[in-house]
């Protein structure tokens, strides 16, 4: 039985050229996290954090994705094309798979505010 919940940073905005932290947190379960996959809106993988082998940044993002903090991901040098959905997939044992969603809006405006509140989708 899957008892856990994924909390995410929800809908966030950040300015073009800046950076943003994508953060998910799995709570209310004792399940062991074996791997966390970070996916972009087109289902392409950005990064994998394997519990035994550590962080793996995909080639297309290696110059502007930084691992962390924690199991989160920092996306740098933002472009307008980065606007869209991002998904964190927690592979756990014995529960199975948990998935969280974040919507990132990249703004031209220099006054874009980056909200970092956690919410349960």
């Amino acid at each position: 039985m899957m008892t856990g919940t994924i909390e995410t940073t929800g809908n966030i905005s950040a300015k073009k050229g800046g950076s943003v932290i994508l953060q998910c947190h799995l709570s209310s379960t004792m399940a062991q996290v074996t791997q966390v996959n970070w996916e972009q809106h087109d289902h392409s993988l950005l990064a994998i954090r394997n519990a035994e082998l550590g962080w793996h940044i995909y080639p297309a993002f290696k110059d502007r994705v930084a691992p962390g903090p924690g199991l989160g991901l920092t996306l740098q040098s933002l472009t307008m094309n980065d606007t869209g959905e991002y998904f964190c997939t927690y592979h756990t044992y014995p529960d199975g798979t948990y998935r969280g969603r974040i919507f990132l809006e990249v703004l031209e405006s220099s006054v874009a505010e980056h909200s970092a509140r956690f919410q349960i989708p």
Epitope: T34, Q35, L45, I48, N50, E52, L53, G54, H56, I57, Y58, P59, A60, K62, H91, Y93
Partner: antibody, heavy 123, light 109 residues
Framework: QLQLQESGPGLVKPSETLSLTCTVS??????????WGWIRQPPGKGLEWIGS???????YYNPSLKSRVTISVDTSKNQFSLKLSSVTAADTAVYYC???????????????WGQGTMVTVSS | EIVLTQSPGTLSLSPGERATLSCRAS???????LAWYQQKPGQAPRLLIY???SRATGIPDRFSGSGSGTDFTLTISRLEPEDFAVYYC??????????FGGGTKVEIK
Amino acid sequence: QLQLQESGPGLVKPSETLSLTCTVSGGSIESGSYYWGWIRQPPGKGLEWIGSIYYSGGTYYNPSLKSRVTISVDTSKNQFSLKLSSVTAADTAVYYCARDGVLTLNKRSFDIWGQGTMVTVSS
Amino acid sequence: EIVLTQSPGTLSLSPGERATLSCRASQSVSSSYLAWYQQKPGQAPRLLIYGASSRATGIPDRFSGSGSGTDFTLTISRLEPEDFAVYYCQQHTVRPPLTFGGGTKVEIK
């Protein structure tokens, strides 16, 4: 389709270093989902995993061989390489390179293999 | 390390018969991490089954895998002439390290 091809000397002297290269064709070694591994098989015996490497250089090794093994990657040539130091006759084997799906979780396996190359350790 | 013991060492059967190969682990292995390979003389191993029960691309449905924990089975429902080969099980953990079983030879009776 993706193919792997091992190359290197077929004869190595005892106490020297065995060096092999695996060339990946039909696809990029910079596939974020896969490691690239080495497995060996002594004549008439079973399979033994040696170690695996990620495109960015991260590795994991068989602890029983770790002190003698170095695996490296050259993304510009789409190749990865194995060095095994201080070899003895016990290292005589067919050496295979293979694609390692350790990051695919429910599909963890070596799904694509090279044809293998025989390496004999003898003076 | 996790030791995989395959039995029997040799299986003598005729074409058309059913083959049942066993792989026993010295400690529990996630079924997600258990694979089976076929190897013919002078050839590289070929992936048959991953995740204990999923057939790899292009593998005929006469091959099936099952099991969990410490006991896993590869079944060939009706042996074809090309199925006579050596079969290896493998567990793909990182720590303890991944290992292969000693193999089962399926030979023509």
